[in-house]
C-alpha cells in the first residue's frame, strides 16, 4: 500500500478541530506582482513581507510595493509601507537582513534618474520605525553587514566605488575606487579586488587583492594577477593566472592573506573553473572543473592547511561556472554530503559520502519501491536524488533535498529509482538516518518542510491546479493526516516557515483570483495543540549514527569518533518545543586507515582502503611550495582526515622537512606585498 | 521594452475558424490578465473575452460566447484567441491589451497594434 | 450586462474651448472600475482615466474624470490639437466588460 495508508497508521485525535482553530487567513489589499518574505532574529516572530508589483515601461517604470509586518510568526500582518514614506522598494537588493539578533532591516529604494545617489530606510527595532538615508552613490549591491559588528555595513556603488558605514548607513566613506568584489573576513576585515586599467572585465587575471582590517585607513596588498577570490571556513582562495599561458592556479591562506601557498590542484585553462562547494574550519570541497564543455570536473578535499588535496570524485556534475551543482551538505548528520555524478553514457546519478569525501557510493534503494525503466537489472538498482539542476531543467521537481542540524538523520528529497536520475514525475523519499537507507514517503511531487525538530514534517502537492490541503506526519514520515485549510481553493506560491525547523507554525502562501484581479494571501497554521504536550524523556530513545554492523566494535565510527544520539521516538506525539537542543554522546575510536586520507602524490584504487603511489610521481622527491619555501615531503602515503579525532591504532610516518629553499608561485612573497595607509 | 504582439488574423470563409496568438515581452505575463477587444472598421471598440493571470478564470461577451476560447501559455508569454464558426460580423481588428492595473499611485494598460480578422466568401 | 451610454455621438469645437463628455450606465458601476480611453485613426485606443477619475501614467492634467454611480464626465479644459480623436468610457468592474458607443471631438 502507499506510504500513509497502512492499517497500522494512527490518527492524531481531533485534529481538524485544534488545526482550525490554529489556522489564521490573512488577505493581502495587494496587486499580485511578486512578494518577498523575510525573518527577522530569531524567536522573535517578526516577518516582513515585501509585495512588489513592477512593470518597465519604455520611459519611466511604474509599479508599487508595500510592507507588512507581523510580530505573531505570521498570523497576523499590518501594513508598514506608510513607514517607508509608500517608496517603491527594489526587489533585486532584497531586504538586507542583519546577523543574529541584532534587528537590523536595509530595505532600498528606488530613485528616480537624475539623483545623486541612492536611498534607503534602515531600522534596528525589528522593522518597527524605519528612518530614510539618501545615499552619497547609487549602490551596485545589497548592503553586506559585518558578521562581528551589525552596524558596520559595506557596499560597493555602480561606478565601482567600495562604500564603508561605521553608524548602520547613517554616515558612508568611499574608501576605494575601482573595485570589483568586496567580502567581509573575520574581525571586521574586508578584502577586495581592484582593477587598474579600466574595468573588472577587462582586467580579469590582473587584478588586485587588497586588505583592510581597520575599515579603509589603511590597506595592504595581499595577491596581484588574481583572477578571483572566495572564502570558506577559515581559508582564504585566490586563483591567480599563471606566468606564462592564460591558466590560474588555486592560492590559499590561513593568515588572512599575509602568507600564501599554492594548492596541489591542477590548474584551469580560461573556460574552466574552480568552485568551493563547502568549506568549514577543518577543509574544504573544492571542485575542479574539466578541460572543454563537458559539465563536469573533479571534486577534491583538502587537508586542514587547504593545501594538499586528495581526488574525491571523478565526473562531478557541475555545468558551468555559476551554473548547477547538486552538491548538498547533509546537515542532520555529520560527515554526509550527496551529489550527482554524470555517467559515460551521459545519464546522471546520485553519489553519497558518510566520511566527509573519503569515499561515496551509490544511495541504497528504497525497500518500498521497484526499479523504474532506467534500470537494467529490475532487482538491483539505487535511488537517485533531484537536486538544483533537475530544478534548472525545469523537471516537476517543486523543491530541493531538505535537512536540518536539530532534526537529527532526517533527509526529505525528491527522487526516482532505478540506474540513473529519471525524467518521469518524481516521487518524494525520506531517511531518517541520514542518508544510509530510504523509504518512499509521499507519491508525486510536494513542497515539505520540517517543523519542531522534525517532530513534524508538513508537505503540500506540486499542482497547476489551486489547492486548499496540507498533508502533515508526526512519525517522520511513515504516516500522513490530511486537513483542508480554506474552503476557497488558492494558487499556492510556497511554504515559508522559521528558519531553523523550531517553529510549530508554517505559513502556506499563494494568490486568490476574483474577476480579473488577484490578491496575495497567507494562511498560517500553528500546530501546537497537536503535539499538545511537551516531550519527556520517556519520548526519546538512544540512537548510534552511522551504524552499520552492531556486531562490530568500531560500528558507528566516522572521522575518528563516534556519537549517540537521544531521538524523538516515532510513536511519541509532543513537544520538541523552541528550546530543544540535540542531545549527543560522543566517543573517541582507534585509528585505522580510514581515517586518513592519501597523501599528495597517493591515491586509492577502488574498493581499496591502502593508498598506493601515483605511477607518474614514483621515485621522484616529494615537494611542493609551502609558504613560499620549498618543502620536501617524507610519507608512506597517508595523512589524517581534517576534523578526524581518533586516537590510537593504525599511525603512519609523516614528516615534512624544510628545504630551505625559497619558491614562488607567481604571487607575491611576503617581502614584496606592500601596505599604505589612507 | 514592454510589448504585445498580435499575429494569426487573415481572410476566412464563415463558419471556418483562425487562432489568433499574442506574444508578450518586457513584463512578468503571468501576473496580467488579459483581454481580446475587437474593433469592426468604422466601429466603436467591442471587449470579446478576458481570462485571469493564472488562466483559472476565462470571461466572454454572449456574442462569441461557445464560439472563441481564450487561453494563455504563462511558460511561453503568450495569449490565445481560438475562433470557430467565424461570422462575417466577426470581421474587425482584434487587440490584445492587458486588463486594467491599478496601484496605490498609478494606472496602465498596454495594447497590441492589432490583427485584422476578414470573414468573407 | 452593463450597458454605457456616451454623449454626444459627436463634439466639434475649437482648440484652446472646454470638452464635457458624458457617459451614462444601465446600472450603477463601483467607481473603482470606470475608464475612459483615447483613440486617433489607425492606433490602438490610449488609456487616459481609471478609477472614473484618476490619470493615467503620462497624461496631461488638462484631463480630469468624475462621477459616480451611474453617470460620469471626462473634461478636457482646454482642447490642444492633438486632443481631436474619439474617445470611449469602459467599466471594467465586471464580466462582461462593456465600451460605451464612443464621442468624436472634431475641430470645428
Known amino acids: 500500500s502507499a506510504p500513509g495508508e497502512d492499517e497500522e497508521c494512527g490518527r492524531v485525535r481531533d485534529f481538524v478541530a485544534k488545526l482550525a482553530n490554529n489556522t489564521h487567513q490573512h488577505v493581502f489589499d495587494d496587486l499580485r506582482g511578486s512578494v518577498s518574505l523575510s525573518w527577522v532574529g530569531d524567536s522573535t516572530g517578526v516577518i516582513l513581507v515585501l509585495t512588489t508589483f513592477h512593470v518597465p515601461l519604455v520611459i519611466m517604470t511604474f509599479g508599487q510595493s508595500k510592507l507588512y509586518r507581523s510580530e505573531d510568526y505570521g498570523k497576523n500582518f499590518k501594513d508598514i509601507t506608510d513607514l517607508i514614506n509608500n517608496t517603491f522598494i527594489r526587489t533585486e537588493f532584497g531586504m538586507a537582513i542583519g546577523p543574529e539578533n541584532s534587528g537590523k532591516v536595509v530595505l532600498t529604494a528606488e530613485v528616480s534618474g537624475g539623483s545623486r545617489g541612492g536611498r534607503i530606510f534602515r531600522s534596528s527595532d525589528f522593522a518597527k520605525n524605519f528612518v530614510q538615508t539618501d545615499l552619497p552613490f547609487h549602490p551596485l549591491t545589497q548592503m553586506m553587514y559585518s558578521p562581528q559588528n551589525s552596524d558596520y555595513l559595506l557596499a560597493l556603488s555602480t561606478e565601482n566605488g567600495l562604500w564603508v558605514s561605521k553608524n548602520f548607513g547613517g554616515k558612508w566613506e568611499e574608501i576605494h575606487k575601482a573595485v570589483c568584489l568586496a567580502k567581509w573576513g573575520s574581525d571586521n576585515t574586508i578584502f577586495f579586488t581592484t582593477y587598474a586599467n579600466g574595468s573588472c572585465k577587462a582586467d580579469l587575471g590582473a587584478l588586485e587583492l587588497w586588505r583592510t582590517s581597520d575599515l579603509g585607513k589603511s590597506f595592504k596588498t595581499i595577491g596581484v594577477k588574481i583572477y578571483s577570490f572566495g572564502l570558506g571556513g577559515r581559508f582564504l582562495f585566490a586563483s591567480v593566472m599563471a606566468d606564462k599561458d592564460t591558466t590560474r592556479r588555486i592560492h590559499v591562506s590561513t593568515d588572512q592573506g599575509d602568507t600564501w601557498s599554492m594548492a596541489q590542484l591542477p590548474s584551469v585553462g580560461q573556460e574552466q573553473f574552480y568552485s568551493i562547494l563547502a568549506a568549514n574550519d577543518d577543509m574544504v570541497f573544492m571542485h575542479v572543473d574539466e578541460p572543454g564543455d563537458t559539465g563536469f570536473g573533479t571534486i577534491f578535499t583538502s587537508d586542514d592547511r587547504g593545501i594538499v588535496y586528495s581526488k574525491s570524485l571523478d565526473r562531478h556534475l557541475y555545468t558551468t561556472t555559476g551554473g548547477e551543482t547538486d552538491f548538498t551538505n547533509v546537515t542532520s548528520l555529520r560527515g554526509v554530503y550527496i551529489t550527482s555524478v554524470l555517467s559515460e553514457d551521459n545519464s546522471i546519478q546520485t553519489m553519497i559520502t558518510f566520511d566527509q569525501g573519503g569515499r561515496w557510493t551509490h544511495l541504497r534503494k528504497p525497500e518500498n519501491s521497484e526499479c523504474d525503466a532506467t534500470a537494467k537489472n529490475k532487482n538491483e538498482c539505487s535511488l537517485h536524488i533531484h537536486a538544483s539542476y533537475s530544478i534548472s531543467q525545469k523537471l516537476n521537481v517543486p523543491m530541493a533535498p531538505l535537512s536540518e542540524p536539530n532534526a537529527v538523520g532526517i533527509v526529505i528529497a525528491h527522487g526516482s529509482v532505478g540506474d540513473a536520475i529519471s525524467v518521469m514525475v518524481p516521487d518524494v523519499y525520506i531517511s531518517d538516518d541520514g542518508g544510509y537507507s530510504w523509504t518512499k514517503m509521499l507519491e508525486g511531487p510536494h513542497y515539505y518542510t520540517i517543523l519542531d525538530s522534525g517532530g513534524i514534517i508538513v508537505a503540500i502537492e506540486h499542482s497547476s491546479r489551486p489547492i486548499n490541503v496540507i498533508k502533515f506526519s508526526t512519525d517522520e514520515g511513515q504516516c500522513w493526516q490530511t486537513y483542508t485549510f480554506t474552503r476557497d481553493p488558492i494558487y499556492f506560491t510556497g511554504l515559508a516557515s522559521e528558519p531553523g525547523a523550531r517553529s510549530m507554525n508554517i505559513s502556506i502562501w499563494g494568490f486568490t483570483e476574483s474577476f480579473l484581479t488577484s490578491q496575495w494571501v497567507s494562511y498560517t497554521i500553528d500546530f501546537k495543540d497537536i503535539l499538545e504536550r511537551n516531550c519527556e524523556e520517556k519520548d526519546y530513545t538512544i540512537w548510534l549514527a552511522h551504524s552499520t554492523d552492531p556486531e562490530d566494535y568500531e560500528d558507528g565510527c566516522i572521522l575518528g569518533y563516534k556519537e549517540q544520539f537521544l531521538r524523538l521516538r516515532k510513536s511519541s506525539v509532543c513537544q520538541n518545543g523552541r528550546d530543544y537542543v540535540v542531545t549527543k554522546q560522543p566517543s573517541i575510536c582507534l585509528c585505522s586507515l580510514e581515517d586518513f586520507l592519501c597523501d599528495f602524490g597517493y591515491y586509492r584504487p577502488e574498493n581499496d582502503s591502502k593508498c598506493v603511489e601515483q605511477p607518474e610521481l614514483k621515485g621522484h622527491d616529494l615537494e611542493f611550495c609551502l609558504y613560499g619555501r620549498e618543502e620536501h615531503l617524507t610519507t608512506n602515503g597517508y595523512r589524517k582526515i581534517p576534523g578526524d579525532k581518533c586516537q590510537g591504532g593504525v599511525n603512519p610516518v609523516r614528516e615534512v622537512k624544510d628545504l630551505k629553499k625559497k619558491c614562488t608561485s607567481n604571487f607575491l612573497s611576503p617581502e614584496k606585498q606592500n601596505s599604505k595607509s589612507n | 521594452e514592454v510589448q504585445l504582439l498580435e499575429s494569426g488574423g487573415g481572410l476566412v470563409q464563415p463558419g471556418g475558424s483562425l487562432r489568433l496568438s499574442c506574444a508578450a515581452s518586457?513584463?512578468?505575463?503571468?501576473?496580467?490578465?488579459m483581454s481580446w477587444v475587437r474593433q469592426a472598421p468604422g466601429k466603436g471598440l467591442e471587449w470579446v473575452s478576458a481570462i485571469s493571470g493564472s488562466g483559472g478564470g476565462t470571461y466572454y461577451a454572449d456574442s462569441v460566447k461557445g464560439r472563441f476560447t481564450i487561453s494563455r501559455d504563462n511558460s511561453k508569454n503568450t495569449l490565445y484567441l481560438q475562433m470557430n464558426s467565424l461570422r462575417a460580423e466577426d470581421t474587425a481588428v482584434y487587440y490584445c491589451a492587458t486588463y486594467i492595473v491599478a496601484t496605490i499611485a498609478d494606472a496602465f494598460d498596454i495594447w497590441g497594434q492589432g490583427t485584422m480578422v476578414t470573414v468573407s466568401s | 450586462e452593463i450597458v454605457l451610454t456616451q454623449s454626444p455621438g459627436t463634439l466639434s469645437l475649437s482648440p484652446g474651448e472646454r470638452a464635457t463628455l458624458s457617459c451614462r450606465a444601465s446600472q450603477s458601476v463601483s467607481s473603482s472600475y470606470l475608464a475612459w480611453y483615447q483613440q486617433k485613426p489607425g492606433q490602438a485606443p490610449r488609456l487616459l482615466i481609471y478609477?472614473?477619475?484618476s490619470r493615467a501614467t503620462g497624461i496631461p492634467d488638462r484631463f480630469s474624470g468624475s462621477g459616480s454611480g451611474t453617470d460620469f464626465t471626462l473634461t478636457i479644459s482646454r482642447l490642444e490639437p492633438e486632443d481631436f480623436a474619439v474617445y470611449y468610457c469602459q467599466q471594467y468592474g465586471s464580466s462582461p466588460l462593456t465600451f460605451g458607443g464612443g464621442t468624436k471631438v472634431e475641430i470645428k
Open positions: 478609477g472614473a477619475s
Open positions: 518586457g513584463f512578468t505575463f503571468s501576473t496580467f490578465a
